[in-house]
Amino acid sequence: LLDTRQFLIYNEDHKRCVDAVSPSAVQTAACNQDAESQKFRWVSESQIMSVAFKLCLGVPSKTDWVAITLYACDSKSEFQKWECKNDTLLGIKGEDLFFNYGNRQEKNIMLYKGSGLWSRWKIYGTTDNLCSRGYEAMYTLLGNANGATCAFPFKFENKWYADCTSAGRSDGWLWCGTTTDYDTDKLFGYCPLKFEGSESLWNKDPLTSVSYQINSKSALTWHQARKSCQQQNAELLSITEIHEQTYLTGLTSSLTSGLWIGLNSLSFNSGWQWSDRSPFRYLNWLPGSPSAEPGKSCVSLNPGKNAKWENLECVQKLGYICKKGNTTLNSFVIPSESDVPTHCPSQWWPYAGHCYKIHRDEKKIQRDALTTCRKEGGDLTSIHTIEELDFIISQLGYEPNDELWIGLNDIKIQMYFEWSDGTPVTFTKWLRGEPSHENNRQEDCVVMKGKDGYWADRGCEWPLGYICKMKSRSQGPEIVEVEKGCRKGWKKHHFYCYMIGHTLSTFAEANQTCNNENAYLTTIEDRYEQAFLTSFVGLRPEKYFWTGLSDIQTKGTFQWTIEEEVRFTHWNSDMPGRKPGCVAMRTGIAGGLWDVLKCDEKAKFVCKHWAEGVTHPPKPTT
């Protein structure tokens, strides 16, 4: 059976697959997914290995019309480095010489300057090029190689291994060489895979059942460390509770060198954040940190300095801490907007069972703002999801030059932020460089400011506007108001009407349904429309909602289904990548972010059309 990294190399024109007959004969044959000789896989960024022979595809020289055969894998050899060129061409790196079918006289696969159909290759059974099943480095644990990646294939006791192995062991622990020749170099590490006993790589906090893995012997960059945690279905450490910090201080007390944690300020327009999307509500900086030096965007925990945190350049090589298991945040469930009949007094705006009001003109210090909100039956607003934040920005009349108190503060326990209404902190969205918590002026209260409504800590004595929030009073069954300019069941935002398509549909079906409604699959023109849509669908239980974006027409170029320019994007991490397909909005923790899906997947969708009675503004000229 093929494992997910293996593939057959298929030429559509001949309808045949590459077949490694012997190390010196790489030919083609009728495709057979059970034939070991037809299975290949990437073993580095640029090397392709024959699974049958554990040897790599290569050439004797970078010249036209030479045979491609198999060689002992050598990551340094220029003659074994392949790259995908435009679309389905596979070429030797740095040259316009391509992997080619050969011809009637030449049965072997050849290196050739021609880029026609005989030089075009796909993964058998898909429309994807060979790079779509690319190599993912596997970072090792423990061992003696400082967490280096597995080198496949590697030689151990004169035998070649293309996968992690338990050879030499009686306990089933899986390991790999980190150079091609373990016998000579003696460098290895354990694989970040599940095997009997692998739980002893983790320390479980008996109080919370959260597990931590301290990789103090590794030397990885922040991004590599994060990848290593993710390969174990974990994330770089986040710390949101004082108890958690205490437990980790104890766990790392015998160590001296810094260890990467998930805290970073890598997002271009926002501040400090945890890589696992936990709220940044507890601060434990080393005195003098975070330093404002550019480039110091990643954070390490310093065991030698009472486990306090320091920001460093992300390319430094350090050990790291991974975290997995129950997170306490999931216990607080925010009801979806559609589940709660929301009735609000005049001048208050409804959302998901609560009512909101901006007090912009009567400026108050935080304590007085809180008192006013409480007198009105509410509290300074708490914000628990990106959807709720986006509702405030897109529908409450929030303005880009606003600076408004919200309920977050660390008045009770220094460096530990809490909501004034007592609800748990499940979400934060700090401005770049925030929270700064400058000690010379006690910054214990939090404001929302700037075009995105992100947050900053502020001295509580500043007179500012504020946002109140209260529980709505349920009025029995909700009366569905028909929004002016929109049909019943459609929701108005600015000049447009929007509707959620409730039948699970492929992209094409969703598009057709919208067209039948004299509408189209939604476009997203800017941050504010995105904010509206995030608050519209983000809390719903379904995972995805189709938008009108796809690269169906021209692979690699994403276009809306209607004649409109793509002027704004909101991609999820690692998107769009090399994947062709159609774009859907995520819900839940990644609410609103765009993922590329296969167009025949079924999802709900959002239709959009101009509201009636709206004068169309002129199209912007570029």
Partner: nanobody
Framework: DVQLVESGGGLVQPGGSLRLSCAAS????????MAWFRQAPGKEREIVAA????????YVADSVKGRFTISRDNAKNTVYLQMNSLKPEDTAVYYC?????????????WGQGTLVTVSS
Amino acid sequence: DVQLVESGGGLVQPGGSLRLSCAASGSIFTINAMAWFRQAPGKEREIVAAVNGGSSSTYVADSVKGRFTISRDNAKNTVYLQMNSLKPEDTAVYYCKAVVVTTTPYSDYWGQGTLVTVSS
């Protein structure tokens, strides 16, 4: 690397008791199992008792069940074999084996052995 040091062997009369201990040292991340084997003159090496690392579940060979017990002190990376009601047929060199996670991919390490002689 990993060293195993056995102690506690010696000469004992039939019906007597001995306690063997085996201490593991070196760059050990974790010990997945520790066991005692024995080899009598002219015979194959056989397992006597073993203790699992994680669960601390134990195994004792039928030939010594009820007389021998194995225990482990995780903090000291040490395993003990308490031998009671010893018989002449228990005479052998007793070897300690540890299955460890260390800085080589090999897992199995053996001690040098300690001689137990049961004789009147």
